[in-house]
Structures are given as structure tokens and as C-alpha cells.
Interface confidence: low
């Protein structure tokens, strides 16, 4: 054992494990209430009977699942990020909307548009948005594919956002792209519909630039014959935001003590 | 007791500022020796007189400077990363080497090749490599440019590694790309010369794919008339590795206590 | 953040990063490190008051979690948050070596 | 790493992550969180022996810095290293809300 006479400086003390657990439990009590900015547990008087609605459970599961491309909790957290974030999601505009008509012919891209009024309903102020993720359910993929995500800019130009190297896979898998900055822009602007494009990565000398990966909500052909959306699993934006009523309490971290 | 009744949980203790500083200073004494795996300060008997060699100072400054695209110290650090890392650098093979001949004609790319025998001299075993950065000195840039880095694969195919959006700038700036995995591969293989390609990002529908950014060590034309290398500032690999003699001490973190 | 910008210009009594410059020669009696001559090591110090118990008023305490006990620890402690490495130059025999020491410089602290 | 894999399967006396499951109903007396019913909060506990002084034997001590005092702190402390968030479902009036609470689950600890 490394301990010896010269271990004068050891801080070892007998620790009451149960006491520490109790303290931790009581601390968690305060922590959760504090993160939610509640002075006490909310009343349960108006809770409707029966199980949780399907949509709420689906949203809960989306939040709980760690998906490919999503990193663990970032660190260090800014003061504002200490507080709980309300989680909402906004589904992609369905593909029979006329906005898609002019973008149907490409073999190297798929397009995803979102209604900004739905985004604003979920997040009234851009500053409240803490994180926005674009989530796509990728289906089976036979070969490795390098894809790129673009944001729609004015008059049909596209701005590069990020890329991902997708490994071959026999099972469906959720992909997540951090699009916080883009969604914050959208919330600040007056547009009604905004969108993304997922494209095959094109190298300057490459010949075959076909997008091989299948994203749930689009047919495999992607040559105009867009399929019906498969339930709730079409692309969506997962939003984490400070609720408006909680936001007024946030102070600048410089003067917080 | 002077404390009011409701202050049971205060952790107030008298702290002697000077004692804390002294303890910290003594801890740093142990920490540095420990990180270097030295039982005592090394003898200075054989140190040559005069100032430090230029190359050593240049290397020291490369290590000290935070450069664009390089993140701060990653966290959490694996156990092996606790220990000091020897820093070396390997310059790009000069452009009059015949390896460059077949890659001279492109307007959208520049090529950088490295001698793997120099890499192996610096890092004898792939497992010793802790970090490898490709560092490029970019000169003035008039327009925003989206560039991509590729690794040379067998028979002149190229594998995408990463990308960077370069903002316009009036002053030169060091760029850094993390290429640890690639260099580890090179150290494992038998090849003599290995290389990277820096290319303009090509979107599938884009027409102008010219690489606008000037990298020190190449002429602005980049159409075959490669310039002489400007001193030590041509592209190089900055390597951080555990010295061979220190490596034998590293143990698996599972059994470390 | 409890970083050098805030802590060095304030009179913060609680957990904060504190200034400490180590001169290798004066403080450690070392001549063998050729570069740098010293460095701003800094350290974390200050209480992270334990601020929750059953008999504590809710309203008084909740706002303080963010500062003093964000991790709801049973015994919150003032520790480094952001650290930076330190490169040094020294000799082994006749051979100069540049080595990088990770996590040597404390840039900010937190109650954890 | 002093993570759940190592700490939960060992009898480590020094700093390690310790198991703690919080059942919202049993431990906190709460019925208002609908999902999850509880979660593995865990916590950090164990000494980080202070292992440097002028009269300490070099050889015995140097190897221990990595474990007990990697930051060369004057008073190293056992604190969370990796944390994970916790999403919950609860109601505000009739409206169910999903919220994410950051840094709620301790996955690993470190002496800092």
C-alpha cells in the first residue's frame, strides 16, 4: 500500500455514506425546483386522467435518446444554461406543399422546409433559444456516404452549414445536426417558410454525386415522386428554449454575485 | 456561538492565503516533475553555453501560440494525457521533389507531402502519438473561402478529412487541422511519402471552384510554377508524443490504483 | 464565469480563480527550465456555501443554486473549470526538448 | 477513469462516483414528475490525499499525482467530471411540458 508514515497530509476522514446520500437527495430537491424556477412543487389538481399523450411521450423519448452526431452536454455551461429548457419540436412542412415544387428534380439533394410561425409559437424570442437540432431518420445505407447540410438563403442560393460521413448500416438511425444559429436567424427574420438541403458531398473531380442515403419521409427515388410521410418520423426540428415566463429572471453572469 | 441559528450549514473556515499559495507552489513542484516522470530536476552539467537554438525557440513558439481552428486543451483528459508530451515538427517535403510533378495542374487544390521516415524518427510507435496538427500559414485573403482537407489514399484517390470556412483577412494567420488519426495510420504503414490535399469546396452545382486562399510556400498562381519555400514557414506537422523512454510507465487506467 | 476577467478585477469572496505567478527560479529554486521563466498558474479558492436543508426557506435558497451549488453536491467545492497547457523547454543531456504539460494554468473556477 | 464502470464494480476508497438512484416519489415525496419515475443521479465521494511536501519521498509520491492531485491543487477535491442531462415530463395546469435539466447525472468523478 502506498500509505506510510509520511502520509501526514492525507485528507481521509470517516464519511457517513447515508448522511451524504441524504444531503445529496435534499440538494437534488432544491436543484430541480431551482432549475425550473418553482418555489414549490406545482399543483396536480388539473392534471387530466389517463396515460400521457403519445406526442408528449414521443417528444420525451426524442430528448432522452442520444442520437448519432449529437454530442453529450456541452461544457462549461453559461449561466443561462443552468436553468431547465422547455423542449418542443416542429415537423417539416409536408412534401405536397407547393414550396417543394421547384426543388424536385435533383438526384444529389433532398429539401426540408419549416413553417416559421410554428417555430415562433414554440420560441417567441430568438434569445430564448438554447439549442435547435435538425433530426432525420436515416434508413438502411449500403455504402459509406458523405453528406452536407445547407441552409436556404435569399433567391435560391444555399449556405453550407456542416457535413457528416455516414457509415453503412443495416438498421435505421437518427441523425442530428446542430442548427441553433440558423433557427435563431429565422426567428429574427420575417420569412414564412425557411429550409434546409441535404446533399451528397461533391468533390471537384468526382463524377457520381448521387445522394445514396434514404431519409424517412422521402421515397428512395427522389426524382419527383415524393412519398407520403411516415407518421411522426419525418424530419423535424427539436428545440430547447427558456420559457418566456422564466426568461425575465436571467441576469448577466458578470454581476451574478 | 456567534452564528445565528439558521446558519447551521455554512462551510466557513479561516483560510491562510499565504499557506494556500505555498502549498500550491509545492504542489506544482511535484506536478511538473511527475508529468515529466523525473525523480529529480535533470542535471545541467552538459547544457551548451549560449542562447537556445533558433529551431527550438520556433518550435516552442509554435506550441505556445493558439492558432485559428485549434481548440483549447480537450477535456476530460485520458490518464495517458496527464503526462508531458514531447513536441516535434516535420516540415513538408520541398516542392521540387518529384512526388509533386503529377499534381501540378489543378486550380482548385494544393498538395502537401511528408516523409514518413522523418515522422518515425520523431514518433517511433503509433501508440505514442498524442496529437498531430497540420499547420499552414495562410496569407491575405480577399474573399471568404470554404476549403476542404483530404488525405492521399492508395492509387491517387483522396479521402475527405475536414473543412474550414476562412474569413477574409488582411494579415497572415496560422491554420491548424487535427490530423492525429491520419498520422497514426501513416506510422503504422510502410509508405515512404504520404500527403494531404487542400481544395476549394465544390458544391454539386457550383461553377467556380478555384482555391483563392494563398498558403505560404506556394506561389499565388498554383498552376505549376511552385515557388521556393519561405524559410521555416512552409506547411508542417506539429507532433505531440510520449517519449519512448517514458511510455513504458503508462498503465491501463482500470488498474491504476 | 468565475474566470480571470471577473475574479482578478473583483473582490469576490466566494469561489473564484486567484492570481498566482510561479517564477521557476525564485519560487521553486529551479534553473533547468529555459523557457518560460515562469507562468501564471493561478488557483481556485473560496467557499461554495452549502445552501439546502429541510428547514431552510425555499425562496431564500433557490436563486443561489446557480452560484454556489450548481451540481447539487452534498459538499460543493471550488475547483478548476477551464485549464490550459504549458509548453516548456529544457535539456536532457545536450539535447533540448520541448514538452507540453497539460492542464497547468487555471483560467476559471466553479463550484462543483 | 473514475467512472461508473470502474467505481461501481470496485471497492475504491478514494475519490470515485458512488451509486445513487433517486425515486421521485419515495425519496422526494413527489408525484408531479410523470417521466421518469426516478433517475441515477450518483455522486462523487472519497478522499483525494494531499500528496506533496518537502519531506515526502519523491519516488513514492510522483506516480500518485495522476490519481490524487492531477491539478496540483492545494486542497484537491473529489468532484464530478462527466455529467449528463435529464429530461422530465410534468404538468403546468393542464399543459404537459417536457423540459431538459442540464448536468443532473454524474457519470464520472475526478480529483481536482
Amino acid at each position: 500500500d502506498y500509505k506510510d508514515d509520511d502520509d501526514k497530509l492525507s485528507t481521509s476522514k470517516t464519511i457517513d455514506m447515508e448522511l451524504v446520500k441524504r444531503k445529496r437527495i435534499e440538494a437534488i430537491r432544491g436543484q430541480i425546483l431551482s432549475k425550473l424556477r418553482l418555489a414549490s412543487p406545482p399543483s396536480q389538481g388539473e392534471v387530466p386522467p389517463g396515460p400521457l399523450p403519445e406526442a408528449v411521450l414521443a417528444l420525451y423519448n426524442s430528448t432522452r435518446d442520444r442520437v448519432a452526431g449529437e454530442s453529450a452536454e456541452p461544457e462549461p455551461e453559461p449561466e443561462a444554461d443552468y436553468y431547465a429548457k422547455e423542449v418542443t419540436r416542429v415537423l417539416m412542412v409536408e412534401t405536397h406543399n407547393e414550396i417543394y415544387d421547384k426543388f424536385k428534380q435533383s438526384t444529389h439533394s433532398i429539401y426540408m422546409f419549416f413553417n416559421t410561425s410554428e417555430l415562433r409559437e414554440a420560441v417567441p424570442e430568438p434569445v430564448l433559444l438554447s439549442r435547435a437540432e435538425l433530426r432525420l431518420l436515416r434508413l438502411k445505407l449500403k455504402v459509406e456516404q458523405h453528406v452536407e447540410l445547407y441552409q436556404k438563403y435569399s433567391n435560391n442560393s444555399w449556405r453550407y452549414l456542416s457535413n457528416r460521413l455516414l457509415a453503412p448500416s443495416d438498421s435505421p438511425e437518427w441523425l442530428s445536426f446542430d442548427v441553433t444559429g440558423v433557427v435563431r436567424q429565422w426567428l429574427s427574420r420575417g420569412g414564412e417558410i425557411e429550409g434546409f438541403r441535404l446533399s451528397a458531398h461533391c468533390s471537384c473531380d468526382s463524377k457520381d454525386n448521387t445522394l445514396q442515403v434514404d431519409i424517412n419521409g422521402f421515397t428512395t427515388g427522389r426524382r419527383g415522386d415524393l412519398a407520403t410521410i411516415h407518421g411522426m418520423n419525418r424530419p423535424f426540428l427539436l428545440l430547447m428554449a427558456t420559457p418566456l415566463e422564466r426568461a425575465q429572471h436571467l441576469q448577466s453572469s458578470r454581476h451574478r454575485r | 456561538d456567534y452564528k445565528d441559528d439558521d446558519d447551521k450549514l455554512s462551510t466557513s473556515k479561516t483560510i491562510d492565503m499565504e499557506l494556500v499559495k505555498r502549498k500550491r507552489i509545492e504542489a506544482i513542484r511535484g506536478q511538473i516533475l511527475s508529468k515529466l516522470r523525473l525523480a529529480s530536476p535533470p542535471s545541467q552539467g552538459e547544457v551548451p553555453p549560449g542562447p537556445l537554438p533558433e529551431a527550438v525557440l520556433a518550435l516552442y513558439n509554435s506550441t505556445r501560440d493558439r492558432v485559428a481552428g485549434e481548440s483549447a486543451e480537450p477535456e476530460p483528459e485520458p490518464e495517458a494525457d496527464y503526462y508531458a508530451k514531447e513536441v516535434t515538427r516535420v516540415l513538408m517535403v520541398e516542392t521540387h521533389n518529384e512526388i509533386y510533378d503529377k499534381f501540378k495542374q489543378s486550380t482548385h487544390s494544393i498538395y502537401m507531402f511528408f516523409n514518413t521516415s522523418e515522422l518515425r524518427e520523431a514518433v517511433p510507435e503509433p501508440v505514442l502519438l498524442s496529437r498531430a496538427e497540420l499547420r499552414l500559414l495562410r496569407l491575405k485573403l480577399k474573399v471568404e473561402q470554404h476549403v476542404e482537407l483530404y488525405q492521399k489514399y492508395s492509387n491517387n484517390s483522396w479521402r475527405y478529412l475536414s473543412n474550414r470556412l476562412l474569413a477574409p483577412s488582411d494579415s497572415p494567420e496560422w491554420l491548424s487541422f487535427d490530423v492525429t488519426g491520419v498520422v497514426r495510420q501513416w506510422l503504422s504503414r510502410g509508405g515512404e511519402i504520404e500527403g494531404f490535399r487542400l481544395s476549394a469546396h465544390c458544391s454539386c452545382d457550383s461553377k467556380d471552384n478555384t482555391l483563392q486562399v494563398d498558403i505560404n510556400g506556394f506561389t499565388t498562381g498554383r498552376r505549376g510554377d511552385l515557388a521556393t519555400i519561405h524559410g521555416m514557414n512552409r506547411p508542417f506537422l506539429l507532433l505531440m508524443a510520449t517519449p519512448l523512454e517514458r511510455a513504458q510507465h503508462l498503465q491501463s487506467s482500470r488498474h491504476r490504483r | 464565469a468565475l474566470d480571470t476577467n471577473y475574479c482578478f478585477s473583483s473582490t469576490e469572496k466566494n469561489c473564484c480563480v486567484r492570481q498566482l505567478y510561479i517564477d521557476f527560479r525564485k519560487d521553486l529554486g529551479w534553473k533547468w527550465i529555459h523557457e518560460p521563466k515562469g507562468y501564471h498558474a493561478n488557483f481556485c479558492l473560496g467557499p461554495c456555501p452549502y445552501i439546502w436543508s429541510l428547514d431552510t426557506q425555499y425562496s431564500k435558497v433557490l436563486a443561489l443554486y446557480n452560484q454556489h451549488n450548481p451540481g447539487a453536491s452534498a459538499a460543493p467545492c471550488c475547483v478548476p473549470q477551464a485549464l490550459e497547457p504549458l509548453p516548456i523547454v529544457y535539456y536532457v543531456g545536450r539535447k533540448p526538448k520541448v514538452e507540453q504539460l497539460s492542464n497547468m494554468i487555471v483560467r476559471s473556477c466553479k463550484c462543483s | 477513469a473514475l467512472d461508473t464502470n470502474y467505481c461501481f464494480s470496485s471497492t475504491e476508497k478514494n475519490c470515485c462516483v458512488r451509486q445513487l438512484y433517486i425515486d421521485f416519489r419515495k425519496d422526494l415525496g413527489w408525484k408531479w414528475i410523470h417521466e421518469p419515475k426516478g433517475y441515477h443521479a450518483n455522486f462523487c465521494l472519497g478522499p483525494c490525499p494531499y500528496i506533496w511536501s518537502l519531506d515526502t519521498q519523491y519516488s513514492k509520491v510522483l506516480a500518485l499525482y495522476n490519481q490524487h492531485n492531477p491539478g496540483a491543487s492545494a486542497a484537491p477535491c473529489c468532484v464530478p467530471q462527466a455529467l449528463e442531462p435529464l429530461p422530465i415530463v410534468y404538468y403546468v395546469g393542464r399543459k404537459p411540458k417536457v423540459e431538459q435539466l442540464s448536468n443532473m447525472i454524474v457519470r464520472s468523478c475526478k480529483c481536482s
Epitope: Q251, R257 | D4, S12 | K13, A63 | -
Partner: antibody, heavy 122, light 108 residues
Framework: QVQLVESGGGVVQPGRSLRLSCAAS????????MNWIRQPPGKGLEWIGY???????YRANWARGRFTISRDNSKNTLYLQMNSLRAEDTAVYYC????????????????WGQGTLVTVSS | DIQMTQSPSSLSASVGDRVTITCQAS??????LAWYQQKPGQPPKLLIY???TLEYGVPSRFSGSGSGTDFTLTISSLQPEDFATYYC??????????FGQGTKVEIK
């Protein structure tokens, strides 16, 4: 710029109560420790007590029975409630911002108000 | 309770003089001692804390020394604006926040 303004002083009869206020501005009040100190006419300074950000208070032994310190962070105001006043409580009452690098420096008075005079007389 | 004894209670000095004021604690307070200056009709002003650390903005002619029970405030070259009353204060914990009785520095 840090400003502390005491109010509520005046002439009061022995045995009566008085509440002094201290309005703070120019710093983040809710995050600072605050002290009350008094100075009888022509005499030295006497520390009354201190209140931490959370509401925890420390008071001099002589002040514990009759004097209560409180704060309202939403109003950036510190209070001193004085009960059963006596002639010897006549003094200028100062509020001061506590300042300390560490725990034990809570009681270094970094910034002071101009004071308010309390006269206890029948 | 701790007692703080300041001496002298008053002194007369001329501009340019070196002035020394002492403060003695009835038990050890390490270096947890502050010095304040007070002019008539004004609140006190912090000069020195931690026995020897000069408060920001205070002229360097003021200095403090000592630890344990014996402390000294020195003004190396007295200036016209330095005529005032000086107080020491111990603060090692909440029941030892005690001021000395003051030293009045007058013009000779």
C-alpha cells in the same frame, strides 16, 4: 459607482423602535454581504452585524437581543430593525458593503454610506 | 471577546513626518486586520486589509505590517490631507469584528 444611502434616522423616545434603511446602487446588491456599523457622537466605531447574500446574519453579542438585520434584494435595500432603544444607542448609523477575498474577509468594510443620525431622547 | 488596543490615542505631527500607529489584539488574529481613515463629518475609508495589503487607490506612503497580536500602520511622509482619525479593525471571524478606539493625528 457604488452608492449607499442610509435613511430612517431621527429623534426617538427610549423604549421605542426604529427601522433604518440603506438603499444600494452601482453594484449587484443581491450578491454582496452587507454590514451595519454605528458611531456614538465623538466616539469610535462599533460593528453591529452583517448579513450574507442568502439572509444568514452575524451580530455582535451586545446587539443580538434588540437589533435585527434583514435585506430585500428585489428593492436593493438593507434594513436594521432596532427595538427597546436606549440613550446609549444614540449614534450615526452606517451601512457598509462587506468585502473579502475569502470567507474570513466578510467583515472588511469596502464601501460606506454617509450615515444617518439616530438620537434616543425623551 | 477579543479586545483591540490602539496607541497612541492621539498624536501631533508635521507635514513630512513619519508616523507610526500600533494596534494590539488580545489574542492572535493571524493577519485579519484592516485599517481605516476617517475625517470629520465623513464615513471611514478603507486603507489596508490583511494587515499589509494596500487598498486600490490608496497612496503608497501608507503601509501596514504585523501578524498575530501586534500590528502597525505607518505613514512614511505625512501629507496635509492625512490629518484624520485612524482605526484598526480585526475580522478573523464573526464574533471578533472589533474596532480599535481610534488614533487622532493632529497638526503640530
Amino acid at each position: 459607482q457604488v452608492q449607499l444611502v442610509e435613511s430612517g434616522g431621527g429623534v426617538v423616545q427610549p423604549g421605542r423602535s426604529l427601522r433604518l434603511s440603506c438603499a444600494a446602487s452601482g453594484f449587484h446588491f443581491s450578491s454582496e454581504a452587507m454590514n451595519w456599523i454605528r458611531q456614538p457622537p465623538g466616539k469610535g466605531l462599533e460593528w453591529i452585524g452583517y448579513i450574507y447574500t442568502s439572509g444568514t446574519t452575524y451580530r455582535a453579542n451586545w446587539a443580538r437581543g434588540r437589533f435585527t438585520i434583514s435585506r430585500d434584494n428585489s428593492k436593493n435595500t438593507l434594513y436594521l430593525q432596532m427595538n427597546s432603544l436606549r440613550a446609549e444607542d444614540t449614534a450615526v448609523y452606517y451601512c457598509a458593503r462587506g468585502w473579502h477575498i475569502f470567507d474570513h474577509h466578510y467583515w472588511v468594510m469596502h464601501a460606506w454610506g454617509q450615515g444617518t443620525l439616530v438620537t434616543v431622547s425623551s | 471577546d477579543i479586545q483591540m488596543t490602539q496607541s497612541p490615542s492621539s498624536l501631533s505631527a508635521s507635514v513630512g513626518d513619519r508616523v507610526t500607529i500600533t494596534c494590539q489584539a488580545s489574542q492572535s488574529i493571524s493577519t485579519y486586520l484592516a485599517w481605516y481613515q476617517q475625517k470629520p463629518g465623513q464615513p471611514p475609508k478603507l486603507l489596508i486589509y490583511a494587515a499589509s495589503t494596500l487598498e486600490y487607490g490608496v497612496p503608497s506612503r501608507f503601509s501596514g505590517s504585523g501578524s498575530g497580536t501586534d500590528f502597525t500602520l505607518t505613514i512614511s511622509s505625512l501629507q496635509p490631507e492625512d490629518f484624520a482619525t485612524y482605526y484598526c479593525q480585526s475580522y478573523s471571524d464573526g464574533d471578533s469584528v472589533i474596532f480599535g478606539q481610534g488614533t487622532k493625528v493632529e497638526i503640530k
